[in-house]
């Protein structure tokens, strides 16, 4: 049975040009993570494996940074990058737990962080 | 059982255009990123296409950019390879090939199909 | 592009002996450096991803190191069905590039 909950950074807004730190954090359970995805609507941007370290796709490798800790973080941001981001949780035994952020990069400096939000 | 196979190669002239595919099973083909991968004739690999799982973006080398274009079906499985303006260095053995979901290597690769281009 | 140099071309060894496969790159690439068999008239065969972990079902006598620029495959007891062409790939940028290839035939 499944009983962890991901809590995220919920919704957040950046502006253009900076930097942004996308963060999951798996609670509720004692399963072991063995891996965490991060992912951009259809691309898969980094992993994050336990034994293993970071990988970053070839896609994103200018433009993403790993951590801190199971975090990402994203850098240059342009509008473009406006959008859903989920943090895939690969457990053992519990299985796969999804965390969802989701992004606006503003044009302007009136970019502010939303309210922290569970999934359970 | 992971299962990929190729089709749709043959004997295409210089600047012809030929249209490969990739029909899977075995797994679900919507939670993938998939490659196409060629080799010459007794040469080495060469990496020719990437997709996204969703087929939303995709990545090319140089040497095949405007030229190929890869694109897939979820609901059909299937992966493609549009080949336009083929040129003899073209010809090879074209593998479709599945990424780990891992990693960003490929676990799984069809048989190949062939692909000569001469006239 | 990142280049990926193979040596030796061909390593000639007999069975039950030790092989070591050398790749180098010609830039970091981290540990985003994977090994491939192949085997005549076959599609390649993932051994090897993120420099040192086996893939599923891989023998233990595989096995690899490095990080950088400089990459080993190493077989500690060649059996007969090890026999083959192998193949390092890096996936630390685009375009993704594998290396020449190093035959690994019998002695």
């Known amino acids: 049975m499944m009983t962890g909950t991901i809590e995220t950074t919920g919704n957040i807004s950046a502006e253009k040009g900076g930097s942004i730190i996308l963060q999951c954090h798996l609670s509720s359970t004692t399963a072991q993570v063995t891996q965490v995805n991060w992912e951009q609507q259809d691309q898969l941007l980094a992993i994050c494996n336990a034994d293993l370290g970071w990988h970053i796709s070839p896609s994103f490798k200018d433009r993403v940074a790993p951590g801190p800790g199971l975090g990402l973080t994203l850098q240059s941001l342009t509008v473009n990058d406006t959008g859903e981001y989920f943090c895939i949780y690969h457990t053992y035994p519990d299985g796969t737990y999804t965390g969802r952020i989701f992004l606006e990069v503003l044009e302007s400096s009136v970019a502010e962080h939303g309210a922290r939000f569970q999934i359970p | 059982e992971v299962q990929l196979v190729e089709s749709g190669g043959g004997l295409v002239q210089p600047g012809g255009s030929l249209r490969l595919s990739c029909a899977t099973s075995g797994f679900t083909f919507s939670d993938y990123y998939m490659y196409w991968v060629r080799q010459a004739p007794g040469k080495g690999l060469e990496w020719v296409a990437y997709?996204?799982?969703?087929?939303?973006?995709?990545y090319y080398p140089d040497s095949v950019k405007g030229r190929f274009t890869i694109s897939r079906d979820n609901a059909k499985n299937t992966l493609y390879l549009q080949m336009n303006s083929l040129r003899a260095e073209d010809t090879a053995v074209y593998y479709c090939?599945?990424?780990?979901?891992?990693?960003?290597?490929?676990?799984?690769w069809g048989q190949g199909t062939l692909v000569t281009v001469s006239s | 592009e990142i280049v990926m140099t193979q040596s030796p071309a061909t390593l000639s060894v007999s069975p039950g002996e030790r092989a070591t496969l050398s790749c180098k790159a010609s830039q970091d690439v981290g540990t985003s450096v994977a090994w491939y068999q192949q085997k005549p008239g076959q599609a390649p065969r993932l051994l090897i991803y993120?420099?040192?972990a086996r893939h599923t079902g891989v023998p233990a006598r595989f096995s690899g190191s490095g990080s950088g620029t400089e990459f080993t495959l190493t077989i500690s007891s060649l059996q007969s069905e090890d026999f083959a062409v192998y193949y390092c790939q890096q996936y630390s940028s685009y375009p993704l590039t594998f290396g020449g290839g190093t035959k690994v035939e019998i002695k």
């Open positions: 090939a599945r990424q780990t979901n891992y990693d960003f290597t490929m676990d799984y």
């Open positions: 997709i996204t799982k969703g087929g939303g973006s995709t």
């Open positions: 993120w420099a040192s």
